[in-house]
Each structure stands twice: as structure tokens, then as C-alpha cells.
């Protein structure tokens, strides 16, 4: 005969937090470690599952195809209910009836998703939205891979993504002193560096590299390098290219300079010679297929030239240099030095020997060029 369960037989309600799509195990333990009758019901008293003889039986609930129990643990008095592929609407109070006791478990299922694609361009905004059961009042705290903490309620917004935001975001949802952790992988589509400067002596080969800060299985898009030479009044397109399945193919290249581009990633360009007329700054843009906006990397070229003309030894640099850079001319193994925070230095009637032209930043040499000054003999006076 069915015994009535009194109020004192009703154990304190437990709260369990679950994640949408995950599996949860709601525990229910009998005092005696033996197989006995048990039932799991929802708040509407609809049977979900239970035991009939030695067999697991399922009721007419919506959970019937996703609910199960660990039969191997029944002999130990453990009558847990496992719910697979959790849905927000699975949030409910579940009752386990065993040994004339009722154990209530409140299950709250949460979901946290990115509103858009998780592959976002640098500077774009990321919004994370929390799905939660009616009546709940959760709080959310997210930590970026770089250690940035952001708090919110039903939505969390990161207005401008930076390249260091790439990686796994860990978000903790709290409700009734319980927590559930979500991990969301965010890929910030950007170049590894926002800007880079190449320092070269006149005539040297120049290499520009544009490594990406992410990897994708299939990478398709198109790009262009615009160049603003210091000596030119306007910028010009140096090269345009396509990127298909990580293979680079050049579409159009300027005739001067004659650039070469690598066909593999990372994007790589070679300029045969560093010349003063090429010194300046460029902007490489990459538009990725199915993404709005473009990736950008700035690249600067600084060119040095040391020349001797008649009695004048000159060292010059062209290109974007900061005012704090020092340009100096010094005679090897001698104290003679001329230094200036300028783009040109010169020595009149230089001593014979090996002169060094140095471009330095706080003592660190960025670029050097050597020039040999040969002794000049006075021209004999014609009789």
C-alpha cells in the first residue's frame, strides 16, 4: 500500500545549475545501500523515470528520451537522474521519491552565447547573451584571456576587441550562491603587429612581413599595399593580391618598385633595393571573405645613405623617424663625432679613415652605414 509522505520527510531543496547542451546528474540517495523503488517526477507530478522490478521505466514527460539513470549504482542506494542535452526549459523542480522520502532538486539551466560570429575583426564589438530560466536573477562575470574582467546581467558587451582578447573567455554565471562556468573561444582577426619599421641602408634588399595573429583552416580574401613615399605628394598602390585557401596570388604589381610577394603565409613582400625615393610608410589591408571590415598593418621604411662629395661627408636618412632618434657620424677608433637629432649630418673636410653613420634610439643602434674617406692630396698648381 502507498504510504503518505509527511512534511518532515521532505528534505531541504538543493539547487543545481546546468549548462545548455550539457549533461547534468541530479543525485538521490537512499539511506540503505540496496536496490529499492524510486521515482523521479517534475513539479507537475508527471513521472519522468523510476524502477519497476529490476527495470528502468520512463513516464510520459518531455524528458523521457533524454533522461536516464545509473543502474550500476542502484545496489549502492544511489538513484540519480541524468539529463542529457540540457535545454533552458528543463529548468524545474525535480522530486525524487525513495524510501518514503522526497528529495527536491531545483535545476536551473543557463546558456551563454556570442551574438555574432566568434571570429571578429580587431575593433569590432563582442556581445555575449545569457539565456536563463524565468524567475531567475543571475549575474555574469567574464574574464578575457588577457585578464580583463567584465560584469553584467543578461548581456555583456566588449565595445572594441583588441588582439590580446583572442583566446578562451571564461564566464561565471552565479545564482543562489551556486556557479556554472562557460568557456567561449573568441578569435580576434588581426595582424600580430599594428605597426613595424624596417631600417635599411641604400641598395639593400628590403623584406616586409605581415604575420597574422590567428590561424584559420581556410583563409580567403584579398589585400592591397598602399604606399606613401616621403618624397611623393600622394600615395600609390604598390601591389594587390588574392588569398585563397591560404595561397597568395598577385593580381597587380607596380612597375617601380618591382615587388616580389611570397605565395604562402605569412604575407611577405620583398623590395629589391632600398632607395630614398621608396622611404615612407605603407598600409597593408586584408579583406577576409564573409567578414565586414578589413585588417590593417602599417609598415615604415627608413633608408640611410652616406656619401662623400668633394670636401663634404654627408649622412642622410629618409622615411618616418621620430624626433628623438639621433643621427651621428663618427670616425672609427677616434673620438671625432658629429651628432644631431635631425635627418642629415655632415662633416666638412673629414679626416681620412673609416667613418660610421649611425641612426640610434637612446643609445641602441637601429641602422649603420660605413664609408671610407680616402686622403685627398692638394692639386698641384699649374705653372
Amino acid at each position: 500500500e502507498q504510504k503518505l509522505i509527511s512534511e518532515e520527510d521532505l528534505a531541504a531543496k538543493k539547487v543545481v545549475l546546468g549548462k545548455k547542451g550539457d549533461t547534468v546528474e541530479l543525485t538521490c540517495n537512499a539511506s540503505q545501500k540496496k536496490n529499492t523503488q524510486f521515482h523521479w517526477k517534475n513539479s507537475n507530478q508527471i513521472k519522468i523515470l523510476g524502477i519497476q522490478g529490476l527495470f528502468l521505466t520512463k513516464g510520459p514527460s518531455k524528458l523521457s528520451d533524454r533522461a536516464d539513470s545509473r543502474k550500476s549504482l542502484w545496489d549502492q542506494g544511489c538513484f540519480s537522474m541524468i539529463i542529457k542535452n540540457l535545454k533552458i526549459e528543463d529548468s524545474d523542480t525535480y522530486i525524487c521519491e525513495v524510501e518514503n522520502k522526497k528529495e527536491e532538486v531545483e535545476l536551473l539551466v543557463f546558456g551563454l552565447t556570442a551574438n555574432s560570429d566568434t571570429h571578429l575583426l580587431e575593433g569590432q564589438s563582442l556581445t555575449l547573451t545569457l539565456e536563463s530560466p524565468p524567475g531567475s536573477s543571475p549575474s555574469v562575470k567574464c574574464r578575457s584571456p588577457g585578464g580583463k574582467n567584465i560584469q553584467g546581467g543578461r548581456t555583456i558587451s566588449v565595445p572594441q576587441l583588441e588582439r590580446q582578447d583572442s583566446g578562451t573567455w571564461t564566464c561565471t554565471v552565479s545564482q543562489d550562491q551556486k556557479t556554472v562556468e562557460f568557456k567561449i573561444d573568441i578569435v580576434v582577426l588581426a595582424f600580430q603587429k599594428a605597426s613595424s619599421t624596417v631600417y635599411k641602408k641604400e641598395g639593400e634588399q628590403v623584406e616586409f612581413s605581415f604575420p597574422l595573429a590567428f590561424t584559420l583552416e581556410k583563409l580567403t580574401g584579398s589585400g592591397e599595399l598602399w604606399w606613401q613615399a616621403e618624397r611623393a605628394s600622394s600615395s600609390k598602390s604598390w601591389i594587390t593580391f588574392d588569398l585563397k585557401n591560404k595561397e597568395v596570388s598577385v593580381k597587380r604589381v607596380t612597375q617601380d618598385p618591382k615587388l616580389q610577394m611570397g605565395k604562402k603565409l605569412p604575407l611577405h613582400l620583398t623590395l629589391p633595393q632600398a632607395l630614398p625615393q621608396y622611404a615612407g610608410s605603407g598600409n597593408l589591408t586584408l579583406a577576409l571573405e564573409a567578414k565586414t571590415g578589413k585588417l590593417h598593418q602599417e609598415v615604415n621604411l627608413v633608408v640611410m645613405r652616406a656619401t662623400q662629395f668633394q670636401e663634404n661627408l654627408t649622412c642622410e636618412v629618409w622615411g618616418p623617424t621620430s624626433p628623438k632618434l639621433t643621427l651621428s657620424l663618427k670616425l672609427e677608433n677616434k673620438g671625432a663625432t658629429v651628432s644631431k637629432q635631425a635627418k642629415a649630418v655632415w662633416v666638412l673636410n673629414p679626416e681620412a679613415g673609416m667613418w660610421q653613420c649611425l641612426l640610434s634610439d637612446s643609445g641602441q643602434v637601429l641602422l649603420e652605414s660605413n664609408i671610407k674617406v680616402v686622403p685627398t692630396w692638394p692639386t698641384p698648381v699649374q705653372p
Partner: antibody
């Protein structure tokens, strides 16, 4: 085992045409770039042409541009080289090659000989 | 087009010798360089890609190094089956170009 088997070589008169085939097996043909490389008698290796994977970009050596056409039939796992306006200097052993994921020619066929002579 | 210059064009060596072949590119090609081996009457066999990565199945006595314009193929201890012609190949961009080859002969 990855295998490439060339066919279609032979003797042809200057100005004539030939179509070389390369049957591929042992790998997912459509996902790799494929190339043709040739070697004239007693000479070194010369790259002729490359066709990228299923996107189909094609590249040619200046010496064959406008005369040779590379193509592929992914459903038949076959690479082709259509050679028109053949010249004596096109006489060579033609090798079919497969590129690896890093776009290097990692597997080579045994080659097929093309002789252009009157 | 990028020119690839191999040296020497031929060399004589004995079994057990350490052999070094160099390849120079006319411009910087990063590490986009491969090496292959060809025996008389046979198809070339790929040995090394990305300047230093050994193709699977290639004996560890073969090694490659270099970046930019200067590259080296080294055979640490020459074996009888290593007597062949070796070619370097730039894979930086099109047109792909080979070195003229280095013939390794028995001394």
C-alpha cells in the same frame, strides 16, 4: 600509398600538340595543388606549370605561357597538360608532382617522355 | 624570376664523408626552399622542405639550413645510395625555380 602515373607522351612534329595525363591515387586529390616539371635530356629540372587545389588558380613558366594549359578533373583524380605549338626545346621527360600542405612538390611520378622532332 | 645558384656543380666524395651543398637565391625567399635528389634514369625524390624540415622517410643524415638567400644541404655521413644529383628549389613565388644541380660522385 600515394602514386602518380603519367601517360600521353610520344613523338610529335614541331607545331604539333599532345595531351599528357597524370592519374593520382592514395590521397584526396582535390585538396592538393598539382604541378608539371620537365627535364630535357642531360639537363636540370624546369618547373612548367601548377594548378592549385579545387579553386583552380593556374601558373605557367614564361617558356610555355600561351602554348600549354594545365587542368584537372577532380572527379577522375586526373591532372592534364595540353601542349600546343610544340617546339624542339620542349623535348623532355615530363613529371607530374603533388604539392603537400606547405605547397612543396613532395611526390613525383615516374615521368613520360615527349620528343618533338621532324 | 628568382635565380637559384647551386655550388659546387659537382663534387667527388667517399663513403662516410660529410658533404655540404650550397644554394643561393637572387633575392630573399624566407625559408621557402626545398631540396630533392635524383638518381640517373629515375624520377626526383623530395628530401627537405621549408629549408630544414625532413620529408617523412628521409634518413636523418640529411639536414638543411638557411634563411633569406643562403641555404645549405648537408649529408653528415655519405652512404653508397646517396651518390646522385641534388637540386634546390625556391618555393617563395611563381615561377618556381630550381638550382642547376650538384652531382655527387664517388671519389
Amino acid at each position: 600509398e600515394v602514386q602518380l602515373l603519367e601517360s600521353g607522351g610520344g613523338l610529335v612534329q614541331p607545331g604539333g600538340s599532345l595531351r599528357l595525363s597524370c592519374a593520382a591515387s592514395g590521397f584526396t586529390f582535390s585538396t592538393y595543388a598539382m604541378s608539371w616539371v620537365r627535364q630535357a635530356p642531360g639537363k636540370g629540372l624546369e618547373w612548367v606549370s601548377t594548378i592549385s587545389d579545387n579553386i583552380g588558380n593556374t601558373y605557367y613558366a614564361d617558356s610555355v605561357k600561351g602554348r600549354f594549359t594545365i587542368s584537372r578533373d577532380n572527379s577522375k583524380n586526373t591532372l592534364y597538360l595540353q601542349m600546343n605549338s610544340l617546339r624542339a626545346e620542349d623535348t623532355a621527360v615530363y613529371y607530374c608532382t603533388k604539392d603537400n600542405e606547405d605547397y612543396y612538390m613532395d611526390v613525383w611520378g615516374k615521368g613520360t617522355t615527349v620528343t618533338v622532332s621532324s | 624570376a628568382i635565380q637559384m645558384t647551386q655550388s659546387p656543380s659537382s663534387l667527388s666524395a667517399s663513403v662516410g664523408d660529410r658533404v655540404t651543398i650550397t644554394c643561393r637565391a637572387s633575392q630573399g625567399i624566407r625559408n621557402d626552399l626545398g631540396w630533392c635528389q635524383q638518381k640517373p634514369g629515375k624520377a626526383p625524390k623530395f628530401l627537405i622542405y621549408a629549408a630544414s624540415t625532413l620529408q617523412s622517410g628521409v634518413p636523418s643524415r640529411f639536414s638543411g639550413s638557411g634563411y633569406g638567400t643562403d641555404f645549405t644541404l648537408t649529408i653528415s655521413s655519405l652512404q653508397p645510395e646517396d651518390f646522385a644529383t641534388y637540386y634546390c628549389l625556391q618555393d617563395y613565388n611563381y615561377p618556381r625555380t630550381f638550382g642547376q644541380g650538384t652531382k655527387v660522385e664517388i671519389k
